[in-house]
């Protein structure tokens, strides 16, 4: 049989500090004993556990030095096969800062948003955007990439975007958020930070919020990774909903849940094409939504909300390669 690698992708991404397993299997015809082994090219290999028909490469607490080419070599007698996997290590902690931390409606005209301790910082991998309500503001005035002061061997970057704001002088200014998104093979992660808009310097709290402190919101897509926990004392943070994906017959099932103790509920608030297009089920701290994969499948933001509290979780789904509709 062929040499099988799990996951089957030729490029696999793992977050810095995270763990990943690569499994390579081979079965030989004629009941011959296969030999399977992972080899590292130009990279530290990690822990390898091999038996007759399989070899498991485990990367724990991944550092940037774990990135590189990993080759699984399998043989049946004198037939040798090999598969190559490129392991990417990325860093994308929930460390967004904004300046100013709160805006004064008639006064502040410029805002900066910085994603700290990230890698890579290429335009295709990391995007920063400023959202006014649900509208993305246009081009940034400037975008800078700087090295973070080095801690250990891993070289990380801070990426800053600066935007000129339109007039926010309305009775209820729309919500302002900075969003950073990391897109890598099989991974799309977003962090979001709210920027409170104050009506005047004496009004310390924006309408409709309990505190001018920015609240990060997290979203992740097409990812087998769990985003790193927010920096700082996470137990002091408000409870947040999370969205999980699992395959289901004919598509995906999304589960929004909040492990916050009794008295909370979650519900879906947004889906591409409108919520009415989906089957939903809500039960207290859990809410399910079925995503069909007919044709290309839906593409866009799914969002759920926690009550009380109003914290949101968002997930961006990318349309898969289109499959032709079934014949009538």
């Amino acid at each position: 049989g062929p040499l099988e690698v799990e996951p089957p992708d030729s490029v696999v991404a793992v977050s810095m500090g995270g763990s990943r397993q690569l499994t390579c299997r081979l079965s030989c015809a004629d009941h011959r004993a296969p030999s399977v082994q992972w080899r590292g090219l130009d990279t530290s290999l990690g822990a390898v556990r091999s038996d007759a028909g399989s070899s498991v490469l485990s990367v724990h607490n991944a550092s940037l030095s774990a990135a590189g080419t990993h080759v699984c070599v399998g043989s049946c007698g004198n037939l040798t096969l090999q598969r190559t996997v490129q392991l990417l290590v990325f860093a994308f902690p929930d460390q967004l800062t904004v300046s100013p931390v709160a805006l004064v409606a008639k006064q502040d005209r410029e805002v900066a948003c910085t994603a700290h301790n990230v890698t890579p910082a290429s335009p295709e991998a990391l995007s920063l955007s400023l959202l006014l309500g649900d509208r993305e503001l246009g081009e940034a005035l400037s975008r800078e990439v700087e090295e973070e002061p080095q801690q250990g061997e891993d070289l990380l970057f801070q990426v800053t975007g600066r935007w000129l704001l339109p007039s926010l002088d309305t009775p209820t200014p729309p919500a302002l958020h900075c969003r950073a998104t990391m897109t890598l093979p099989g991974v799309q992660l977003s962090h979001q930070r709210a920027i409170p808009v104050l009506r005047s310097l004496t009004s310390r709290e924006p309408p409709g919020t309990t505190s001018p402190e920015a609240t990060p919101e997290l979203s992740s897509t097409r990812s087998s990774e769990s985003p790193a926990p927010p920096a700082g004392n996470s137990s002091a943070r408000p409870c947040r909903p999370k969205i999980h994906q699992s395959p289901a017959a004919g598509g995906l099932e999304l589960l929004c849940e909040a492990a916050c103790g009794p008295g909370v509920a979650v519900g879906w608030t947004q889906a591409p094409g409108g919520l009415e297009a989906y089957q939903r089920r809500e039960a207290g701290a859990q809410a399910w939504l079925s995503v069909p994969r007919a044709g290309c499948g839906p593409e866009g933001w799914f969002q759920c909300r926690l009550d009380p509290g109003g914290q949101m979780a968002s997930l961006y789904l990318v349309a898969e390669v289109c499959s032709p509709p079934a014949p009538p």
Epitope: V11, L41, L64, A67, G68, T69, T84, Q86, L87, L88, V89, T119, P120, A121, S122, P123, E124, A125, L126, S127, L128, S129, L130, E136, L137, G138, E139, A140, R143, V145, L155, F157, G161, T181, M182, T183, L184, P185, G186, V187, Q188, R222, E299, V318, A319
Partner: antibody
């Protein structure tokens, strides 16, 4: 099949302006980072500008910053490069390139055929 | 900016030869290195991305290796259609930069 088709090139005087267009078909346009790359006659490839899938994040080479603007019109599946204050050294074939949606930093998988911009008096 | 330096700048070889082109980055770019092939009057074509991943449809005689700052593109057995110019490119941090190119000619 993905196709990128550039247009808008031509002869322009130094200090003049041109707008290049790149019409895309066959790819999830509003999810694909897109890029302009140029190649001066007989020279190598030079990256010019990239815009993120949503268009909210844009990057420019220092050589064009402040003079060129990349933008996209998602309903029209079209990428643009507005080039102002053109100089003789901007003379090149300009390629538009796109990556597949699911690979954050894969290279530019799809390329147009290029459009020639000549800046000369 | 990260400088990408290719060597050699040009190379003569025969059909069936094994050819290696090297690319050196002025600082570490981890695994964010891609290789392109360009023929006269045509747009570049992706051969290899993330150091060693072969682009769909590219023959297996092309392979890539390396990490950090030093990378190589190897063509195991040259075919007539492989005579072209080859570029490496980093997209680790902006600005994205290309090598100056290696022109592969028929001996």
């Amino acid at each position: 099949e993905v196709q990128l088709l550039e247009s808008g090139g031509g002869l322009v005087q130094p200090g003049g302006s041109l707008r290049l267009s790149c019409a895309a078909s066959g790819l999830t346009f509003n999810n694909s980072a897109m890029t302009w790359v140029r190649q001066a006659p007989g020279k190598g490839l030079e990256w010019v500008s990239t815009t993120s899938g949503s268009g909210g994040t844009t990057y420019y080479a220092d050589s064009v910053k402040g003079r060129f603007t990349i933008s996209r019109d998602s309903p029209k599946n079209t990428l643009y490069l507005q080039m102002n204050s053109l100089r003789a050294e901007d003379t090149a074939v300009y390629y538009c390139a796109a990556r597949g949606y699911s690979y954050g930093t894969t290279p530019y998988e799809y390329w147009g055929q290029g459009t020639l911009v000549t800046v000369s008096s | 900016d990260i400088q990408m330096t290719q060597s050699p700048s040009s190379l003569s070889a025969s059909v069936g030869d094994r050819v290696t082109i090297t690319c050196r980055a002025s600082r570490s770019i981890s695994s964010y290195l891609n290789w392109y092939q360009q023929k006269p009057g045509k747009a570049p074509k992706v051969l290899i991305f993330f150091v060693s991943s072969l682009q769909s449809g590219v023959p297996s005689r092309f392979s890539g290796s390396g990490s950090g700052t030093d990378f190589t593109l190897t063509i195991s057995s040259l075919q007539p259609e492989d005579f072209a110019t080859y570029y490496c490119q980093q997209n680790y941090i902006p600005p994205i930069t290309f090598g100056q190119g290696t022109r592969l000619e028929i001996r």
